[in-house]
């Protein structure tokens, strides 16, 4: 019985448009055929929920309609993507794994991507 | 604040049934995983069962197997453990617990006493 | 399942000395997923340390978690009169569930 490693970028820069998208890949210790995918966000040792999607394997990822987050699943690969991003939501983006079914269970956590959101400069008044 | 509060404890027979539950607070229910655990008097610690988020997905400890039936109702922020079959060796304080976002049991209840004695 | 085994049963100690608690499991890789647990007479357990080494929120910092592979520690550096309590290893990282046995941290 082996613990489920989770990796992840270690640093990801939001595009200006507030748009940041990350890998997040696992090794799973059996055949998972039911997977749950969460985004925490860990700042000030504050830990929330940024989404959450649970998908069966060779089906796609699909969140809540109101969620920021989308993405697609490739095997045991997760491509994620944030949006709506802001400078004040720069911090440690955590993907948390958990492979519901069939038994046993299995839980794994990335270490985090930090990302960095820098919010654009307004554009100046033109004088025409 | 965040709490759990089980009720429904008592005395029963042995071979009887009983229903014990646990009303969560403080916290979006429908996004944690909620444990049972249990605690004859004076031992340890064992984990008895878990529901996750939404309720499809069950596990259990093998003495409790085929026996216990763990449920939950999002609506009412509600965990519940339907005990049938019981035996003297199901006495015990019954705690329930959250999974927290990492994982670990982070949140628990005060318990609830289940005495199975003819 | 993962058999975890605490030692030493019982430690004898006074307010101010230091406490190291030991855990065991019997399968590697579970390191990420060790937690430690405190519990007092008539209360429920309260979760010390997740993660093998991050203490929980509102944990004192006299409370520390370390060790990986099948090896785990506790280390309380100074005990405090409330810190007399029995303290219980467990794994979250695959179903079932598993705890230690539990190790009595009591007054000399």
């Known amino acids: 019985c082996k613990a489920m490693h989770v990796a992840q970028p270690a640093v990801v820069l939001a595009s200006s448009r507030g748009i940041a998208s990350f890998v997040c890949e696992y090794a799973s210790p059996g055949k998972a055929t039911e997977v749950r995918v969460t985004v925490l966000r860990q700042a000030d040792s504050q830990v929330t929920e940024v989404c959450a999607a649970t998908y069966m394997m060779g089906n796609e990822l699909t969140f809540l309609d109101d969620s920021i987050c989308t993405g697609t699943s490739s095997g045991n690969q997760v491509n994620l993507t944030i949006q709506g991003l802001r400078a004040m939501d720069t911090g440690l983006y955590i993907c948390k794994v958990e492979l519901m079914y069939p038994p046993p269970y299995y839980l794994g956590i990335g270490n985090g991507t930090q990302i960095y959101v820098i919010d654009p400069e307004p554009c100046p008044d033109s004088d025409f | 604040q965040v709490q759990l509060v089980e009720s429904g404890g008592g005395v029963v027979q042995p071979g009887r049934s009983l229903r014990i539950s646990c009303a969560a607070s403080?916290?979006?229910?429908?996004?944690?995983?909620i444990h049972w655990v249990r605690q004859a008097p004076g031992k340890g610690l064992q984990w008895v069962a878990v529901?996750?988020?939404?309720?499809?997905?069950?596990y259990y400890a093998d003495s409790v197997k085929g026996r216990f039936t763990i449920s939950r109702d999002n609506s009412k922020n509600t965990l519940y453990l339907q005990m049938n079959s019981l035996r003297a060796e199901d006495t015990a304080v019954y705690y329930c617990?959250?999974?927290?976002?990492?994982?670990?049991?982070?949140?628990w209840g005060q318990g609830t006493m289940v005495t199975v004695s003819s | 399942e993962i058999v975890l085994t605490q030692s030493p049963g019982t430690l004898s100690l006074s307010p101010g000395e230091r406490a190291t608690l030991s855990c065991r499991a019997s399968?590697?890789?579970?390191?990420?997923?060790l937690a430690w647990y405190q519990q007092k007479p008539g209360q429920a357990p309260r979760l010390l340390i997740y993660?093998?080494?991050s203490r929980a929120t509102g944990i004192p910092d006299r409370f520390s978690g370390s060790g990986s592979g099948t090896d785990f520690t506790l280390t309380i550096s100074r005990l405090e009169p409330e810190d007399f309590a029995v303290y219980y290893c467990?794994?979250?990282?695959?179903?079932?569930?598993?705890f230690g046995p539990g190790t009595k941290v009591d007054i000399k």
């Open positions: 403080g916290f979006t229910f429908s996004s944690y995983g």
């Open positions: 529901i996750w988020y939404d309720g499809r997905n069950k």
């Open positions: 617990s959250r999974s927290g976002s990492f994982g670990a049991f982070d949140i």
């Open positions: 993660g093998a080494s």
């Open positions: 399968q590697s890789g579970s390191s990420s997923y």
């Open positions: 467990q794994q979250y990282g695959t179903s079932p569930f598993t």
